[in-house]
């Protein structure tokens, strides 16, 4: 994939360490949730397919002032090789569907656990 004179390439399938850490953080968020997560903020739903990490970051980055997900945002940036900023829109978003951050985190967690079980770390 050539992009603006640069060369983007997928890396080898990384060891499970990174994915496990991300799953642990999402578990931590769901378990420690008392009041509505991020005051019930809504985010775009995403297709949980290739490019999922970047799409998840693009969606969550639009939630500001929510310390509970700051670590998740930072962790997702370590999975996504692109520069992501608030207001960006990805084709991987389900444009007409917005869900609460809490539901977004649960959906993402379930999918990542499935990938982990199947040994698909990338």
């Amino acid at each position: 994939l050539t992009c603006l004179g640069g060369f983007a390439s997928p890396g080898p399938v990384p060891p499970s360490t990174a994915l496990r850490e991300l799953i642990e953080e999402l578990v931590n968020i769901t378990q420690n949730q008392k009041a509505p997560l991020c005051n019930g903020s809504m985010v775009w739903s995403i297709n949980l397919t290739a490019g999922m990490y970047c799409a998840a970051l693009e969606s969550l980055i639009n939630v500001s002032g929510c310390s509970a997900i700051e670590k998740t945002q930072r962790m997702l940036s370590g999975f996504c090789p692109h520069k992501v900023s608030a207001g960006q829109f990805s084709s991987l978003h389900v444009r007409d569907t917005k869900i609460e951050v809490a539901q977004f985190v649960k959906d993402l967690l379930l999918h990542l656990k499935k990938l982990f079980r199947e040994g698909q770390f990338n």
Partner: antibody
Framework: QVQLQQSGDDLVKPGASVKLSCKAS????????INWIKQRPGQGLEWIGH????????YDNEMFKDKAKLTVDTSSSTAYIHLSSLSSEDSAVYFC?????????????WGQGTSVTVSS | DVLMTQTPLSLPVSLGDQASISCRSS???????????LEWYLQRPGQSPKLLIY???NRFSGVPDRFSGSGSGTDFTLKISRVEAEDLGVYYC?????????FGGGTKLEIK
């Protein structure tokens, strides 16, 4: 505190390969990009590429596509750059630098650099 | 590739003076996400570069307020209001908006 510790200086023969390392400590390795930068003696800085340690995905400068391969070992929090088919043009100091999401991906911490000398 | 041109190449100053370094890009460096990833780094003799300014005008943690960055589009400036001895070295601008990311050629700040 955040530290990027790079491997020692290397003297290699033309045509050979070398693998330089950058060991990270003091932060969650998989949450920040690692950039690699080249500096030839008395010259400026050149960006080689960056790697997202969580996925192993890279963005590379096309100019270094056949020269440099970026990898990570998340279990040891170490990033690597593998330089192949070395020539005198590759004699330089190579820096690794952390790309921070918090500071809009700017390179907020740098390793001390590894000097590679290509000579027969 | 985006060419980053810095002027002057060398900047002799007296301690306490103001210094200004210009950086011009060969094309607009606004990223597709709307942000301008323009940074300034200082490399002191025999050391690794250090981050001073990110996203055009934001000072990195611990950077004295005598350093300020400004600009937009293709023209950017780093200003040092009162030069101190520890400020001497080579200053590089860097664009991280378009791959391959590129550095300016450097400006050497030295004592007059």
């Amino acid at each position: 505190q955040v530290q990027l510790q790079q491997s020692g200086d290397d003297l290699v023969k033309p045509g050979a390969s070398v693998k330089l390392s950058c060991k990270a400590s003091g932060y969650t390795f998989t949450s920040y990009w690692i950039n690699w930068i080249k500096q030839r003696p008395g010259q400026g800085l050149e960006w080689i590429g960056h790697i997202a340690p969580g996925s192993g995905e890279t963005y590379d400068n096309e100019m270094f596509k056949d020269k440099a391969k970026l990898t990570v070992d998340t279990s040891s929090s170490t990033a690597y750059i593998h330089l192949s088919s070395l020539s005198s043009e590759d004699s330089a100091v190579y820096f690794c630098a952390r790309g921070s999401f918090t500071f809009f991906y700017a390179m907020d911490y740098w390793g001390q650099g590894t000097s590679v000398t290509v000579s027969s | 590739d985006v060419l980053m041109t810095q002027t002057p190449l060398s900047l002799p100053v007296s301690l306490g003076d103001q210094a200004s370094i210009s950086c011009r890009s060969s094309q607009n460096i606004v990223h597709s996400n709307g942000k301008t990833y323009l940074e300034w780094y200082l490399q002191r003799p025999g050391q690794s570069p250090k981050l001073l300014i990110y996203k055009v005008s934001n000072r990195f943690s611990g950077v004295p307020d005598r350093f300020s960055g400004s600009g937009s589009g293709t023209d950017f400036t780093l200003k040092i209001s009162r030069v101190e001895a520890e400020d001497l070295g080579v200053y590089y601008c860097f664009q991280g908006s378009h791959v391959p990311y590129t550095f300016g050629g450097g400006t050497k700040l030295e004592i007059k």
